[in-house]
Amino acid sequence: ACDTATCVTHRLAGLLSRSGGVVKNNFVPTNVGSKAF
């Protein structure tokens, strides 16, 4: 899977969208590695 910063950011945005934004406050691109997905 793509693990560039841009891929991580877009994947996280999708996850936030699907979850309705109900995730931890520190669940942001710069805190999340590709393995979190």
Epitope: C2, T4, A5, T6, C7, T9, L12, V28, P29
Partner: antibody, heavy 119, light 107 residues
Framework: EVQLVQSGAEVKKPGASVKVSCKAS????????MNWVRQAPGQRLEWMGD????????TYNQKFKGRVTITVDKSASTAYMELSSLRSEDTAVYYC????????????WGQGTTVTVSS | DIQMTQSPSSVSASVGDRVTITCKAS??????VAWYQQKPGKSPKALIY???YRYSGVPSRFSGSGSGTDFTLTISSLQPEDFATYYC?????????FGGGTKVEIK
Amino acid sequence: EVQLVQSGAEVKKPGASVKVSCKASGYTFTDYYMNWVRQAPGQRLEWMGDINPNNVVTTYNQKFKGRVTITVDKSASTAYMELSSLRSEDTAVYYCASIIIVPDYFDYWGQGTTVTVSS
Amino acid sequence: DIQMTQSPSSVSASVGDRVTITCKASQNVGSNVAWYQQKPGKSPKALIYSASYRYSGVPSRFSGSGSGTDFTLTISSLQPEDFATYYCQQYNSYPYTFGGGTKVEIK
């Protein structure tokens, strides 16, 4: 409103260095990666590198062979791109850019900084 | 580095025309492609990410498709404000790379 505001135009001599700043506002600066991209006159866009402002880890385009250094000042929500050993081919517009999720999911770009390298 | 080859390099079109721009990657980049619009003297404006998703505020006449190595940006009905240069970008691997651009000109 998310904004990326860059420093003003620079004129440099060959062999000198230039440091361009990018002041971020309207979002949490440390939450999102910052990219630097340049565009020489009439040329395609060229990615230079990015930085994670949270842990200050950088990734660079090896084309620049150690000439580029990206840094941040977290307290000032500002990113910097320094390019050393300037040559005429480095004459370009330099942009900072960041993909933000909150408050608005978008790929934001600074207004650009023109760097002219001339003897 | 991954090469992104755009075609055509320029296209002349009229308001209301359908315009298609293609981008070919030198190796598989999945769906990790973005499209940008740039007007003279201005910063690039993001249109599409992940090959086919429009950013909020981008008109629905812009659409993207493709995966792997072949990608397309389509403007379904060209508007006066759409005359600009368009760039594709791959962000599947470092360094990110851009296509050479397609200039959409008034016929």
